[in-house]
Interface confidence: low
């Protein structure tokens, strides 16, 4: 088992909103849960966009999930990752 490296980035969207993206890379096996949470609770599927779980050329995998949120509420959002029985939570960088 190779645990993922998780990286959260943010970019400007429409006025008052930002798009936050959570990327998991270099993990094996390919099964992974990656989702955005608000107040600790997973957002609905239709408010998130997922990338495919793709091989990264090193025998490991990569994927991403993104959502658009209100800039004033960004501290309420975290990216949750679960892989091979381990989990971690990642905040939006300020």
């Amino acid at each position: 088992t190779v645990p993922p490296m998780v990286n959260v980035t943010r970019s400007e969207a429409s006025e008052g909103n930002i798009t936050v993206t959570c990327r998991a890379s270099s993990f094996y096996p390919r099964n992974i849960i990656l989702t955005w949470r608000q107040d600790g609770v997973s957002l609905s599927h239709d408010t998130q966009q997922w990338g495919d779980v793709l091989p990264d050329g090193n025998g490991t995998y990569q994927t991403w999930v993104a959502t658009r949120i209100c800039r004033a509420e960004e501290q309420r959002f975290t990216c949750y990752m679960e892989h091979s029985g381990n989990h971690s939570t990642h905040p939006v960088p300020s």
Epitope: R37, D39, G40, V41, S44, P91
Partner: antibody, heavy 122, light 112 residues
Framework: QGQMQQSGAELVKPGASVKLSCKTS????????ISWLKQKPGQSLEWIAW????????SYNQKFTAKAQLTVDTSSSTAYMQFSSLTTEDSAIYYC???????????????WGQGTLVTVSA | DVLMTQTPLSLPVSLGDQASLSCRSS???????????LEWYLQKPGQSPKLLIY???NRFSGVPDRFSGSGSGTDFTLKISRVEAEDLGVYYC?????????FGGGTKVEIK
Amino acid sequence: QGQMQQSGAELVKPGASVKLSCKTSGFTFSDNYISWLKQKPGQSLEWIAWIYAGTGGTSYNQKFTAKAQLTVDTSSSTAYMQFSSLTTEDSAIYYCARHDYYGTSGAWFAYWGQGTLVTVSA
Amino acid sequence: DVLMTQTPLSLPVSLGDQASLSCRSSQNIVHINGNTYLEWYLQKPGQSPKLLIYKVSNRFSGVPDRFSGSGSGTDFTLKISRVEAEDLGVYYCFQGSHVPWTFGGGTKVEIK
């Protein structure tokens, strides 16, 4: 499961502030959401706010935004709530509680501290 | 805010009886992610509350199977199939779907 040990009872004067602590052990502190709740004698519970220990991010019940301030000290795995401008209406037991959002659970207040009694009296 | 109304206020029971507690919310408490975050807590005198049921019908770890939760939308029920002495206390329902999260006023289960 872990433990949550709250600080002892407080007797404070109206207008003063009080800082309550909730020392945790037995789980990864920085991975958790911790809420504070209020219960007046013989009454129901009110949710005050939560803090995400990993970042110090918070969300407040609007009713308490001017009253409560939540902080964490990750080095000691302790959560704090400062309550300010106290009145007799703030006399209550205050609880800290840990959320359990992992796996399939999604439970809000899964593990509780023993509570701290705050009495506001002249 | 979502108002949670519990009935009855007091429920006298005999040990071994079935008890049924009701909780009604002032609005639908389905979270935007599709889950219904309705929980039940038991508080015994002088103790902290303890979680019994989460997401309407899921028993928390260590909770006996005589406790069961049901309901949807705005109407929810907690049933205790055979009341034991250790079940006496005040039961609170709680919604975590809409901020601010709110509790019901409680139902006190006591010996008849």
